[in-house]
Interface confidence: low
């Protein structure tokens, strides 16, 4: 409790005491009768009047003083209240600012944690990629140091799958040019020998016309690596191959390609489609993975 508030309570008590004094009980009756007889009565009356006057003056003076004190206290209290309200408002504002700052700090911390997590993930990916590249490069080095007859790993940027390496073009060439490109890479246009391989290639090329290593430019359908066509896997579209001549480009359709749904179609070999190169890994066992 503040000192001003204690004083205020004391003032109230004092006021109460003075009220009780003004309303005091009358003197006993037999004594009054005794005093009211003769000159003593006058003297007593004067004395009492004088006493009463003194009392009144004292009380008036004290009351005036008390009123002044009360006014001062009220003013002080009013100022204190205003000051307190201002301080409370100030504290409230500061509290709001602190809250906002806290939220901002929390948000920043959260973002930094997220950034750190992303950096960590990115770093892990880079490390994995680095290890993969390192393994690939060490394998390339081994291949270069060897007599070149054995390939135990895929070239850089080629995808390994089931003991074969695949390279997926992003540009288009005529079938013969695509075939030549693969040969220059010591590979051949992709030869599809199973449903599983079909699905793998299809996943990587997407819904895009893409040449494969199958043609019938010499009559029978023929895989470029010598795999027997007649006994092998086939995935033609219905009614294909049809060796269609209606395209008006001269000649029939002698080269096979993956269509947008993965099934095969025969088409004019001059069309500039994307292509897939394939090369087989040697049977020699691979090095154990570094990770």
């Amino acid at each position: 409790m503040t000192k001003e508030y204690q004083d205020l309570q004391h003032l109230d008590n004092e006021e109460s005491d003075h009220h009780q004094l003004r309303k005091g009980p009358p003197p006993p009756q037999p004594l009054l009768q005794r005093l009211c007889s003769g000159p003593r009565l006058l003297l007593l009356s004067l004395g009492l009047s004088l006493l009463l006057l003194v009392v009144v003056c004292v009380i008036g003076s004290q009351n005036s003083q008390l009123q002044e004190e009360l006014r001062g206290l009220r003013e002080t209290f009013s100022n204190f209240t205003a000051s307190t309200e201002a301080q409370v408002k100030g504290l409230s504002t500061q509290g709001g600012n602190v809250g906002r700052k806290m939220k901002s700090l929390e948000s920043q911390l959260e973002k930094q944690q997220k950034d750190l997590s992303e950096d960590h993930s990115s770093l892990l990916l880079h490390v994995k990629q680095f290890v993969s590249d390192l393994r690939s490069l060490s394998c390339q080095m081994a291949a270069l140091q060897g007599n070149g007859s054995e390939r135990t790993c895929c070239p850089v940027n080629w995808v390994e799958h089931e003991r074969s390496c695949y390279w997926f073009s992003r540009s288009g060439k005529a079938w013969a040019d695509a075939d030549n490109y693969c040969r220059l890479e010591d590979a051949h246009l992709v030869v599809v020998t199973s449903w599983e391989e079909q699905k793998f290639v299809q996943h990587h090329i997407g819904p895009v016309n893409t040449w494969m290593g199958l043609h019938d430019q010499n009559g029978p359908w023929k895989w470029v690596d010598g795999t027997d066509y007649e006994t092998g896997f086939k995935n033609w579209r219905p009614e294909q191959p049809d060796d269609w001549y209606g395209h008006g480009l001269g000649g029939g359709e002698d080269c096979a390609h993956f269509t947008d749904d993965g099934r095969w179609n025969d088409d004019v070999c001059q069309r500039p489609y994307r292509w897939v190169c394939e090369t087989e890994l040697d049977k020699a066992s691979q090095e154990p993975p570094l990770l």
């Epitope: 019938d216 010499n218 060796d243």
Partner: antibody, heavy 118, light 106 residues
């Protein structure tokens, strides 16, 4: 209509040469692979050779490899079979046939008889 | 090299169904073509890719292929169907013919 007509057959001595021709009409000759198939008297059919539509690739049966040469002249719509070092076992009717993709041989010419005899 | 085996001859009563077989190792995995050759004439394609018929060939001619045997079926056989029949497949870049079957319509 599609038509194939062979010519150039005849009697020839062993070790000598002969050139067969096959004139094509009724279709775009330069768009099709072409074959030679032979049939010895009273025997079955034997495939001899194939040439791609543009002449860029040729394949032969083992029995004639190194002795026979398949060729074509697309400007003349004509298929050829140059036969060298002929043997008695080469005696047969020689047919030329068109190959429309993976549909078998269709059609065939009427054939020309080659007889290798001394 | 790949070999195709055909029966030398098959007989069928007029109007009945004739079946000519062509045997080969896993032939069901290959496309089989059938040719008809009448005496003194060039062969003509009657069935290609196991079961397809070229235009102009009657519906009476049908084909099937599975396992180690391909079959040419001629229903309601007619006298005009009497001929030699050859099956054919591709083995790498080489065409291989069966020995041929002589169909006799009784």
């Amino acid at each position: 209509q599609v038509q194939l007509v062979e010519s150039g057959g005849g009697v020839v001595q062993p070790g000598r040469s002969l050139r067969l021709s096959c004139a094509a009409s009724g279709f775009t000759f330069s768009s099709y692979a072409m074959h030679w198939v032979r049939q010895a008297p009273g025997k079955g059919l034997e495939w001899v050779a194939v040439i791609w539509y543009d002449g860029s690739n040729k394949y032969y049966a083992d029995s004639v490899k190194g002795r026979f040469t398949i060729a074509r002249d697309n400007s003349k719509n004509t298929l050829y079979l140059q036969m060298n070092s002929l043997r008695a076992e080469d005696t047969a009717v020689y047919y030329c046939a068109r190959d429309p993709g993976s549909y078998g041989f269709d059609p065939w010419g009427q054939g020309t008889l080659v007889t290798v005899s001394s | 090299s790949y070999e195709l085996t055909q029966p030398l001859s098959v007989s069928v009563a007029l109007g009945q169904t004739a079946r000519i077989t062509c045997g080969g190792n896993n032939i069901g995995r290959r496309n089989v073509h059938w040719y008809q050759q009448k005496p003194g004439q060039a062969p003509i394609l009657v069935i290609y890719r196991d079961r397809d018929r070229p235009s102009g060939i009657p519906e009476r001619f049908s084909g099937s292929n599975s396992g180690n045997t391909a079959t040419l079926t001629i229903s309601r056989a007619q006298a005009g169907d009497e001929a030699d029949y050859f099956c054919q497949v591709w083995d790498s870049s080489t065409a291989v013919f069966g020995g041929g079957t002589k169909l006799t319509v009784l």
